[in-house]
């Protein structure tokens, strides 16, 4: 077969080929940020000629053109400046309202390099309607000027702009517009990963929150967790494997889907995952009807086995057939469970479509979506039971209109996205479920994305202040209880002046809470062994603080999981009959267990907890500490089995002010507190300039650094005594 000519350079840009110069190969142009390629792509035909998708005239030279953002077509009850036909990257547009109207949204917006405006639609509203003025996004035209209950507004985009979101919205009884805000965008525009991850994550979190099986009910026997067997999520992952997707891109599709699976299984919801790859025909690699679809390792292994070559005989893009196979799966499940049963009706369904182009065979995918909506009985009441996310990758031949038609439309959420390339997709999936926006007390969720603040990464972390100075740290273990060290409280029982500083999304300084009561372990007495020549003894160095009010859960404030509780059991995805011993065996399962604590400046520092034989050699060093323990004969008099030991090799040592803070591990994207910082032989902060300065101990230091942390597995009776009504403990 003839190959296509190689004179396809683009001035100022670059290009890639999916299959070299051979027929069927897709040539994709790219330009530096702020420019877009015209045309975006070319396909090598079997005749040996390049064809530009969608082009009517003969082949023109490829060029990089400047990206521009759409201009406002109309702006009600106010004025905007400057008034241009379109705006260059970096250009601003400013909005002001007439008297009597209040500006909602962004007063100034800037054109970003992807052809999208930053900020939010500016609206001048006088608050007169049942629903707020829905505004007119830049580049759009709206018909309908009444905002009463039942009133409708319609939108269209000017010139060659493409509408994403809802073209029609209705003012609902609850004062909220149906659907999602329409946005007019250039056909070549795309989304930045940092915008997509939170948008996708927020929407997903709403769904996860709704599917959370730990419905708590007050009973006379304290709190029990009811696992709602009905709380179930079916997740369908559809991966495009058509000819225009290169093998490398398909690998990234798979990797991104694996990330998604990994994250979704880390939430305590009952989930089944289906995997479907498609080109001209769909191939079901895992069905929700298969019991293995509930097993993360099975799902990931079926993903790993997905083969790019499976579809080499049919290379079109049949999105209809892929979605139809989801419909057939749903139909079979409905027949199995019974159409009228709660077991069927309570399943939530999420479809994630990863594609690089528009469907070009098999009919309109919208038809399949209509069938899906019908079988799931999706109406205003059951809108929460279906979410379809349509994600286009590679700006080339992705059809905005089609993606928008397929994606769900929900108020304040977005379900249709176009990303520049598969790298951006990977970034999104890495970060999308790190937003931890769930408002219930789901434990041990920290935001792991690169741009998260320290407090968002460890939202359980709190600071304890006796008066003005900070003295100790602690960890939220519920929405009203903090776990910390007993030695922080050495002033008797007057805690009226003490404050606990908890993370707060509205303030970088956090929010201060008074202490309703302090429960200090009665076994703690630093002088208990003074007559044995042990000048300081930290056995039972544990305390609980009940805050005067409940903490509102947010990205910045959320409890850590305490092992040996039902909450932690769910997070670990362990079977229901698990015991405390099982948790200890799973979490402290090696001679050296990587763990973390939080530094004075909020950053997460690394340590290794020594277990078994290594614990003994870790603790042995204490015998060299002659000041605190002048005539010590048995190290175990000081380092009892209540303590975990760290501080060897490259470990960081905690400072005195980090006492009481959690010593925690990460498992399955969730965090579990196994200890709390108690005492040590070296203080890296002593006499430092500020919270950011730590000094490493010199290698020659005698004794070398060692740090001891109260082991929560050894404090179970005390924890159960005081938290029995707060947490749900497993049998020992």
């Amino acid at each position: 077969a003839p190959s296509c000519p190689q004179n396809v350079n683009i001035s100022g840009g670059t290009f890639t080929l999916s299959h070299g110069w051979a027929p069927g190969s897709l040539l994709t142009y790219s330009c530096p940020q702020g420019l877009y390629p015209s045309p975006a792509s070319r396909l090598c035909k079997s005749s040996g000629q390049w064809q530009t998708p969608g082009a009517t005239r003969s082949l023109s030279k490829a060029v990089c053109k400047p990206v521009r953002c759409p201009a406002p077509v109309s702006f009600e009850n106010g004025i905007y400046t400057p008034r241009l036909g379109s705006y260059p990257v970096g250009g601003n547009v400013s909005f002001e309202c007439e008297d009597g109207f209040i500006l909602r949204g962004s007063p100034v917006r800037q054109c970003r390099p992807n052809g999208m405006w930053d900020g939010e639609t500016a609206v001048c509203d006088n608050g007169a309607g049942h629903c707020p003025n829905p505004g007119i996004s830049l580049g759009a035209v709206r018909t309908g000027f009444r905002f009463g209950h039942g009133d409708k507004v319609r939108y269209r985009c000017s010139s060659n702009l493409v509408l994403t979101g809802s073209s029609e919205r209705e003012c609902q009884g609850n004062g909220v517009w149906s659907g999602t805000e329409p946005i007019c965008r250039q056909p070549y525009s795309y989304d930045f990963p940092e915008d997509v991850a939170p948008a996708l994550g927020t929407s997903f979190s709403h769904m996860l929150g709704a599917t959370n099986p730990t419905q708590k009910t007050k009973e006379s026997l304290g709190r029990k967790i009811q696992i709602q067997r009905s709380g179930h999520l079916n997740l369908y992952l559809l991966l495009d494997c058509s000819q225009s997707v290169s093998e490398n891109d398909f690998l990234i599709f798979k990797e991104s889907a694996s990330l998604m699976v990994d994250r979704i299984f880390s939430f305590e919801i009952n989930v089944s995952v289906a995997i479907i790859t498609f080109a001209s025909e769909p191939k079901v690699l895992m069905s929700v009807l298969n019991d293995n679809s509930r097993d993360m390792t099975e799902v990931i292994s079926s993903l790993e086995n997905a083969n790019y070559k499976d579809h080499e005989n049919g290379t079109g893009t049949n999105t209809y057939a892929a979605l139809n196979s989801v419909y057939l799966m749903m139909n079979n499940q409905m027949r199995l469970l019974g159409m009228e049963t709660m077991a069927w009706q309570e399943i939530r369904h999420a479809i994630i479509l990863l594609t690089d182009g528009k469907s070009n065979m098999g009919g309109s995918p919208k038809t399949a979506v209509d069938h899906i909506r019908e079988i799931l009985n999706i109406n205003q009441k059951r809108n929460d039971y279906l979410d379809i996310y349509a994600i286009g990758v590679g700006k080339l031949d992705v059809d905005w209109r089609e993606l928008n038609e397929l994606g769900s439309k929900k108020d304040g959420e977005r379900h249709a996205f176009i990303l520049q390339d598969t790298k951006a997709l990977h970034q999104v999936f890495e970060h999308m479920l790190d937003v931890s926006k769930l408002t219930d007390t789901i434990c041990g969720v920290g935001n792991m994305s690169a741009n998260a603040s320290d407090q968002e990464r460890t939202p359980w972390h709190v600071t304890i202040k006796p008066k003005s100075q900070e003295t100790c740290r602690g960890a939220l273990i519920s929405d009203q209880w903090v776990l910390t060290a007993a030695h922080c409280f050495r002033d008797g029982n007057d805690h009226s002046l003490w404050r606990v500083n908890v993370g707060d999304p509205k303030s970088q300084w956090g929010k201060e809470f008074l202490i309703e009561k302090a429960v200090i372990s009665p076994g703690f007495d630093v002088f208990a062994k003074k007559n044995q020549g042990i000048l300081e003894f930290y056995g039972d160095d544990i305390a609980l603080l009940k805050l005067a009010q409940k903490v509102k859960m947010s990205t910045h404030a959320r409890p850590i999981c305490l092992p040996c509780t039902m909450e932690a059991n769910l997070a670990l995805r362990r079977p229901q009959g698990s015991t405390c011993r099982d948790h200890e065996n799973e979490l402290l399962n090696k001679q050296s267990v990587p763990a973390h604590f939080v530094a004075l400046n909020g950053s997460k520092l690394n340590i290794n907890l020594k277990m078994g034989v290594e614990w003994t050699s870790c603790a042995e060093v204490v015998s060299q500490e002659k000041t605190m323990f002048p005539n010590l004969t048995d190290v175990r008099e000081v380092v009892t089995d209540q303590f975990l030991c760290s501080g060897t090799q490259e470990d960081e040592s905690p400072c005195k002010g980090e006492s009481g803070g959690a010593v925690f591990l990460e498992r399955r994207f969730r965090f579990f507190q196994v200890g709390l910082v108690s005492w040590g032989l070296y203080n890296p902060c002593l006499g430092s300039a500020d919270k950011n300065s730590r000094k490493r101990a010199p290698r020659s230091k005698v004794p070398p650094p060692r740090d001891f942390h109260i082991n929560l597995f050894r404090m179970q009776p005390w924890l159960r005594q005081h938290l029995g009504d707060v947490l749900n403990f497993l049998p020992l």
Partner: nanobody, 122 residues
Framework: QVQLVESGGGLVQPGGSLRLSCSAS????????MGWFRQAPGKEREFVAS????????EYADSVKGRFTISRDNSKNTLYLQMNSLRAEDTAVYYC???????????????WGQGTLVTVSS
């Protein structure tokens, strides 16, 4: 907050000894870590020694280890620094400090004395 007053500074020959005292007012003295800092002319304030609230553990800057001894008497609300084998480079204003956490971060300390001058010179 603890009020602190240092005393015992003065002129001493190299190799000589001096004992500094720091008297604290406030019933909470016994629950504070206590420390000594010093500041030589034209230099930054630097950590010298600290003692835990229990009196059970002490820490020293490398430059004074083996020569200086920190101690406290909780019944008298007093902190001491015994300085032996003094050198010219020990010349500085010596400050007493109280810290609840025990880290003695310069940016966070809010209880300082006014300082007492120690001059080591022949």
């Amino acid at each position: 907050q603890v009020q602190l007053v240092e005393s015992g500074g003065g002129l001493v020959q190299p190799g000589g000894s001096l004992r500094l005292s720091c008297s604290a007012s406030g019933h909470t003295f016994r629950s504070y870590y206590m420390g000594w800092f010093r500041q030589a002319p034209g230099k930054e304030r630097e950590f010298v020694a600290s003692i835990s609230w229990t009196g059970g553990s002490t820490e020293y800057a490398d430059s004074v280890k083996g020569r200086f001894t920190i101690s406290r008497d909780n019944s008298k609300n007093t902190l001491y620094l015994q300085m032996n084998s003094l050198r010219a480079e020990d010349t500085a204003v010596y400050y007493c400090a109280a810290d609840y956490s025990g880290d003695f971060l310069l940016s966070d300390l809010d209880s300082w004395g006014q300082g007492t001058l120690v001059t080591v010179s022949s």
